[in-house]
Every structure is written in C-alpha cells, then in structure tokens.
Interface confidence: low
C-alpha cells in the first residue's frame, strides 16, 4: 500500500463556506431532451454543451438544438446557438473536437431530405466563431482528424465514398469509391478497405486493403482477401481469409503494409472474432474468440514484432463481436491490466496482471471487508470488479473502473468481495498502489472522479431520488466530507470534469422537474479554496511502485526496471496544481529468465522458466513456416519481453537454430499467395 498516515479523520477547515463561495449554478433555458458536453483543448476552460430536443410529429421528427459555451470550466455558459444559425445539430455525430490544443471543432447539421449534401459548422478558435460549409456529400461518419495535422479531415459518405479535406473542411475531394472502413495511420497516411462487387457486407473476406500516403494522389494495394483491419501502436493488423476454407488469420505489418508476416495465432471461423484489446509501440494484447457461442476466448500477448504470441489468459470474458469485455488498462501504474474470466461454473471472476499479461492473479481481498454469499470459505475470497459487462447487464453499477496517469497508483472501482462477481448492490473500492491492495472506500454505488492529480476525489451517490449532496476526500478516499451544493435537489445525470484529472473544478449535471416543465441545470464547484496552498517538497514522499517484498533486492522490478515516484502524502491538503508533472526515478534491474518469452518453436514446461524446444511444429505452425520470413525462423529460443529494459543478469544465449529444417509441409508454396501493388 502506498504511504499513508493512520490518523483519525480530520475535517477540512471551514469547507462549507469555502465551497459555497465557489459553487456556480447555471439553469439552461431548455426542455430536457438530451445533453452532450465536450471539452475544447487542454487547460483552456472551454466547454461546449449541445442540448437537443426531439418532438415526434405524425410524419417526421422535428428537432431543436441549442449550443452553449463556457470559458471558465463551466461556471458560466453563454448561448451561442445563433453562431450556428439556430441549426439542428446531429447528436449521433457528436462534436468533433480537434487533436491537442488545435481549438478546432466540427458540428454536423441535420439537413432536409432533398439536399445535395450535408452541412457542417467549423471553428478554429475554440468555438468563438463558426463557419458554415455545405458538403458535396452526405456524411456517414463523424469527421476524423489526422493526428499529425488537424487541417486534414476524412469522412465516409452514405454512398461509401472516401472524402478528404486538406483545409479543415473548407474544400472536399472524393479520393476513392466503394470504401468500407478508413483510418488515419501515422504520417498522414490513410488506410482503407474497398469492395469490388456488391457491398461491404457481401464482399467481407474479399475486400482489398489500400494505402495512400499523399492524401489520395497515389495508392497502393497492400492486402487482398481482407475481412477487416486494425491499427494498434506501431502495428497494422489485417484478418485475411484462408485459401482453402472460410477461416481467417491475422497478418501483421510494422512497415505500414509494405511487408506482412503471419501472426502465430489460431485461425478463426465465420462466427468467431479477433479483437485488439490494447496496443502500444512495444506489443499488443489480442483476444481470440473461442469457437461456438461461449462468450469467452483467449488473451494472447505479442512479441516486439507482433508475430509470436504467448497465451496470457484463458476463458477471457468477451461477449460476441463488438460486445462487452471488462478488459481495463490501469493507467495509473505501468504494466497493470484488469479483466474478467468466465469460470467453469459460469460465474464471473476478476483477474489482474501487474506485468503486462505475464501472470494473472485474483485481486487481494480488502482488509476491511467480509466475504459475501458467493464465497465457499468465508475467510478466503477475492475482490471482483464491476466493469463494462456488469453495466451492460444493467446491474447497479453507474461507472466503470477509473484510473488516471497523473494520479499515480490510484484505481477506483465498484466491486464485490467473494468468489465471483455478485449481482448484489456493489460498494466502491480504492487501491492506492495500482491494484495490489484494496480498501472499501464508499458504501453502495457512486459516481466518482479524480481532481488535481489525485489531491481530491469527488463522489456522488447513485440514487433514483433527487440529490443535493456531494462527497469529497483529500486523502485518497480514507476520510470523506459531505457538502450540500443546493437547497433544491436535482435528478442527477452526470459528473463532468476536465479530462486528465488536473482540474479542481467539477460540474454536476442534472435536471429539475416541476409540474409543467423540466430544465437542464449544472452546478460547478471549484475546490481551489479547499486546497489553499501549493504543495511543497515536504508534502511528497518516495514510493517504490510494484513493491511486494521490501527485503528483496529485485523488489519493484517489473519488465526489467523499477520506478520510484514522488507521491503526495495522504495527510497533505495542498494543490498539486495544473502544471503538476509526475516525478519518477527509474532504475534498471538485472535480467532473469522471467524477462524473456519463448520464441516460435519453443515453450515453457509447467513450473519451469526455461524455454524448451518443441519436438515438432504442429498444425497452423506449418503455415507460419510456409509464409514466415527467413529471419523469423532463426532463433535461440528466447526473445526479450516487449518493453523490458533489464540488463545483465541472466543472458539466455545459446546456439541459433534454423527452424526451416522442421518446416516440412505439403501446403501451397508461398508464391501462390495473392498480392498486388499499384
């Protein structure tokens, strides 16, 4: 557990008066309908709120929307609907906010049936002004910004055309027809799939994958017989139909599709799917669905090339394609992921890994909790976390797990303590050490958010009744104060705080209901006066991440290095501030066999850390032999785990084997593989 002081809960001095002076109400002159909120830029304080109200008429739906803007983190809003000519905005496209601090916003308008194309409103100045632009097409998708250049936009039309703009939506050009899916890659590259015959659906498995690196001046076909494709980190993945049957396999490229290698993953049939759960520049987590409608599959983790995969977790819960998985990247501590497995008895259990998928374990039982009715042994059980799947099943879970990169070690989640996830009303638990240890933080379900890089946690009880109380903690959830932010309770709909958890402002959204009408209302509370002073050096303490055994020289070593962080003391009530940067001191660890994965053609016997040569390469491995590039088939049996920085120590070097000798197969020769290039 991260350092903390075991002390009686001290009240924050005069907090009611301080918060009352910093609570700002805004009543929106709107019927209820729906509301969406977007932050424009980072640390700008600019928020856009779009309210929409649908009136169903006999022949058509009449819509009305209003646009509001705040530039003080939601304390005050101005109605700027006139800037978009009082046009009805299509909420399904949301507000397309430009990357980084570009200040760019695109709103897509609803247009009448007979029009030639759609209409957008564009702003380059953080929504101070908008320009109306009529489109030469009807958009099917939201405008997508190039990550490298916010002036470059792409969109798909309802007629499957791929349209590109080079001047932030002023002019548009159709660069290709019959396009199913398009994505920006790195360096303003666009990848997209095309169909030749009927449609995207009819040609699934016979699509072509194309690439343009010059916004449509020239193209290269980089794949055929494509089912779908995806980008993750520096990897480009494509699922490709096999020559002989209806199965498909993953192929991977690390050079934007110029060359491909077959991933050493099981092939999947028509009813199965692959899913990239997480990816970075080092490696990828891949889910491979089990045959049949099981609701689970297997997680595999890749090597640094995306080619060789190690089985990471069996019976991983993932309902049908595009369905629900609880897979969660704990962003507050390197290497930590949480997900759910479906056990043999069909109960759902939470698993956690601290080493990027190397080993998975159950979550440690919180010390201040009892095992519930799901536990066979009342003294031995685990914490089980509610995430996307529980939410989809309409359990009483208002929020998924929460972690923030700049609130080091903090994870907040709904959970239950037993042998499996319980359908009973959950409580809220917190970990201050990235998931190693947990404490019950709040009784019953709550909405929660992190402010000031962890300096403040705010929570609101999840209730069907109107609410007027907010809870806050300045010591990572140990002690809570309650503040009544309004005399008149509201029907609560959501908490909003600036992404990145650096802000000290929280907005509480809801609506008031009277006999005749209901109106949107927001309360923005600024906690700056609760954290009166800036944090100083004495307010921080050194914390070694991943520490499980302080007596061990290698304590804290994960993926070949350990990291010491400066953490805010729980007893310090001060501002980290908007400019707070996480201070960490890495140190390299000595290598052990645990820092290596077994290369293609090798495996680890149970309870052994050495990689042993497989007697022969069976099954689909033969395809890998057939299509595998020469350099991938020579190995010494070990590859360093992606992202592992260890040095020295164990160096498992031995003679390099040429696996080609084992590759004997009657399959087609590689030359038979289809490929064409423009």
């Amino acid at each position: 557990s991260a350092p903390g002081e075991d002390e009686e809960c001290g009240r924050v001095r005069d907090f009611v008066a301080k918060l009352a002076n910093n609570t700002h109400q805004h009543v929106f002159d709107d019927l209820r309908g729906s509301v969406s909120l977007s932050w424009v830029g980072d640390s700008t304080g600019v928020i856009l709120v779009l309210t929409t109200f649908h009136v169903p008429l006999v022949i058509m739906t009449f819509g009305q929307s209003k646009l509001y803007r705040s530039e003080d983190y939601g304390k005050n809003f101005k109605d700027i609907t006139d800037l978009i000519n009082n046009t009805f905005i299509r909420t399904e496209f949301g507000m397309a906010i430009g990357p980084e601090n570009s200040g760019k916003v695109v709103l897509t308008a609803e247009v009448s049936g007979g029009s030639r194309g759609g209409r957008i409103f564009r702003s380059s100045d953080f929504a101070k002004n908008f320009v109306q632009t009529d489109l030469p097409f009807h958009p099917l998708t939201q405008m997508m910004y190039s990550p490298q250049n916010s002036d470059y936009l792409l969109a798909l039309s309802t007629e499957n055309g791929l349209w590109v703009s080079k001047n932030f939506g002023g002019k548009w050009e159709e660069i290709h027809k019959a396009v199913c899916l398009a994505k920006w890659g790195s360096d303003n590259t666009i990848f997209f799939t095309t169909y030749a015959n009927g449609s995207c659906k009819a040609d699934l498995g016979a699509l072509e994958l194309w690439r343009t690196s010059d916004l449509g001046k020239s193209f290269k076909t980089i794949g055929v017989k494509i089912y779908s494709f995806g980008l993750g980190g520096r990897f480009l993945f494509a699922s490709v139909m096999a020559d002989k049957d209806t199965t498909r396999r993953i192929h991977v490229s690390t050079d934007q599709g110029d060359t491909w290698s077959m991933a050493q993953l099981p092939s999947v049939g028509q009813e199965q799917f692959y899913s990239i759960l997480a990816a970075n520049d080092d490696m990828v987590f891949m889910h491979v669905d089990e045959p049949g409608d099981t609701g689970f599959g297997t997680i595999f983790t890749s090597d640094d090339r995306g080619i060789v995969y190690s089985k990471s977790l069996d019976r991983h819960l993932y309902t049908t394609t595009g369905g629900e998985t609880d897979f969660t990247n704990v962003t507050s501590l390197r290497g930590v992921y949480i997900t759910s497995v479906l056990s043999e008895d069909n109960s759902i259990q939470t698993m956690i890994t601290f080493d990027q998928g190397g080993r998975w374990t159950h979550l440690r039982k919180p010390e201040n909790s009892e095992c519930d009715a799901t536990a066979k042994n009342k003294n031995e059980c685990s914490l089980h976390i509610h995430a996307s799947y529980s939410i989809s099943q309409k359990l009483n879970v208002p929020m998924a797990p929460l972690s923030e990169p700049n609130a080091v070690g903090i994870v907040i989640a709904h959970g239950s303590v037993g042998d499996a996830i319980s359908v009973m009303v959950p409580d809220v638990y917190i970990s201050d050490d990235g998931g190693y240890s947990w404490t019950k933080m709040l009784e019953g379900p709550h909405y929660y958010t992190i402010l000031d890089s962890g300096g403040i946690i705010v929570a609101i009880e999840h209730s069907s009744r109107p609410i007027n109380v907010i809870k806050f903690s300045t010591d990572e959830g140990q002690c809570w104060q309650t503040y009544t932010f309004t005399r008149d309770p509201i029907y609560f709909t959501g908490l909003a705080s600036e992404p990145g958890a650096r802000s000290m402002n929280i907005s509480i959204w809801g609506f008031t209901e009277s006999f005749l009408t209901s109106q949107w209302v927001s309360y923005t509370i600024d906690f700056k006066d609760i954290l009166e002073r800036n944090c100083e050096e004495k307010d921080y303490t050194i914390w070694l991440a991943h520490s499980t055994d302080p007596e061990d020289y290698e304590d804290g070593c994960i993926l070949g290095y350990k990291e010491q962080f400066l953490r805010l003391r729980k007893s310090s009530v001060c501002q980290n501030g908007r400019d707070y940067v996480v201070t960490k001191q890495p140190s390299i660890c000595l290598c052990s066999l645990e820092d290596f994965l077994c290369d293609f053609g090798y495996y680890r016997p149970e309870n052994d850390s050495k990689c042993v040569e497989q007697p022969e390469l069976k099954g689909h491995d033969l395809e890998f032999c057939l299509y595998g590039r020469e350099e991938h088939l020579t190995t010494n049996g070990y590859r360093k785990i992606p992202g592992d920085k260890c040095q020295g120590g164990v160096n498992p070097v031995r003679e390099v084997k040429d696996l080609k000798k084992k590759c004997t197969s009657n399959f087609l020769s590689p030359e038979k593989q289809n490929s064409k290039s423009n």
Epitope: D552, L590, V650
Partner: antibody
Amino acid sequence: QVQLVQSGAEVKKPGASVKVSCKASGYTFTSRYMSWVRQAPGQGLEWMGIINPVGGSTSYAQKFQGRVTMTRDTSTSTVYMELSSLRSEDTAVYYCARDPSGIALAGPASRPYYGMDVWGQGTTVTVSS
Amino acid sequence: EIVMTQSPATLSVSPGERATLSCRASQSVSSNLAWYQQKPGQAPRLLIYGASTRATGIPARFSGSGSGTEFTLTISSLQSEDFAVYYCQQARLGPWTFGGGTKVEIK
C-alpha cells in the same frame, strides 16, 4: 578461504585514468555481485557502484556516472574498476567488496541484505600533478 | 538517494562501558541495513547485517536493532580492540549509501 586481492598502489596525473583490479577466490565468482567503495583521506566510505559478474551489468552512483566503468573477466574471476578524467579529489583508497545481492533467476524471493561481507585490502590511488 | 545520518560523530567511552551508536535514514530502508567497523589502515569489517544479525565471527557484545528509519548499534562492554570508526549502510534502494561514521574513542 574467501579472498579479494586488489592491484597495487597507483600515482596518476590529473586528467589521466586508473584501472584497479580485484581478483576473487574461495567462492563461486558468479554467485555474488561486487561493489566498489572508496575512502578519501580522513573521510568516510563512499559507494561507487556495483557489477553483476554473470551478465556484466552495472549500476553506478550518479556522482561517478560517465567517469567510471566496471567490467569483469569470468575466466580469471576478476573485476575491474576504471576511473577516468582524474582530479585531485579522487585521491583515495579504493576497495572492492563482495555484495550479497543474489541473482534473481525467477520471480521475487525474500532475500535479506547480508552486507558486504568480504573486502579487498584496498588500492591507494594518488592524483597529483 | 537515501541519506544516512549517524550520531554522534564522536563518542568517548571508557573500556567496559556501554556504547550506543545511532543511524537514521531519510526514508524507510526496512531492515536492509548493515554496520561496519573500520580501524586505521584497514578495510572495513562487516559486523551486523539485516539490521540485527551478527556476521560470522562477531562477538556477542555487538548487537543491532531498529527497522524503517531508526537504527542502533550497541556495544555492551567496550574492549580495547573495539575503539574504531563505525559506519552504517543501507541497501534498500540504489545507490547504496553510507552514514558519515561514528568514531568511538577512549575516554
């Protein structure tokens, strides 16, 4: 018995480099790390860094980063410490000391710190113009 | 880095008396602490490791205690051969660091 025998005294000019050797005997050379510690005249002990004889990996104190290089020769069970860009304040006795931090072959194991249990006799390095 | 502070810098004790040496760490070092004895012209000698365990061949009059940030070396009855400089050293987190030393001299 377990012994660490260091090379003889050295006199160097400022800006030069010195390389001190430390030959281990009486135990398995690769089973223990080796630390280097120095002591300026009339001063306390100052840890310089550590080397793992198995892979040759090192960890240096920030103060010596860029100036110190620790190497090992497993065939002769010898570790070396080279200090470059010498200045007068580098005048000191340099010790090698067997460090107990064992090599983690598998996951974390509980290993208390056993202290630097065997020390070389010391090598006096004098830096003077 | 972890700073180790020893006190007192000099301790004057008569033979046969008890000597208590103190060592404080700027942050917890758990029990990853060792004590060394050094006599003029000699290399240091390990006395205590793991904060409280005597090294091989060290007489029972030497004892160590403490964990976290506060440590003590006690010499129950000083002998003439015990007059020397004593250093504490942490090995909780790199870089290893030594205290400034306590000189035990004859009163």
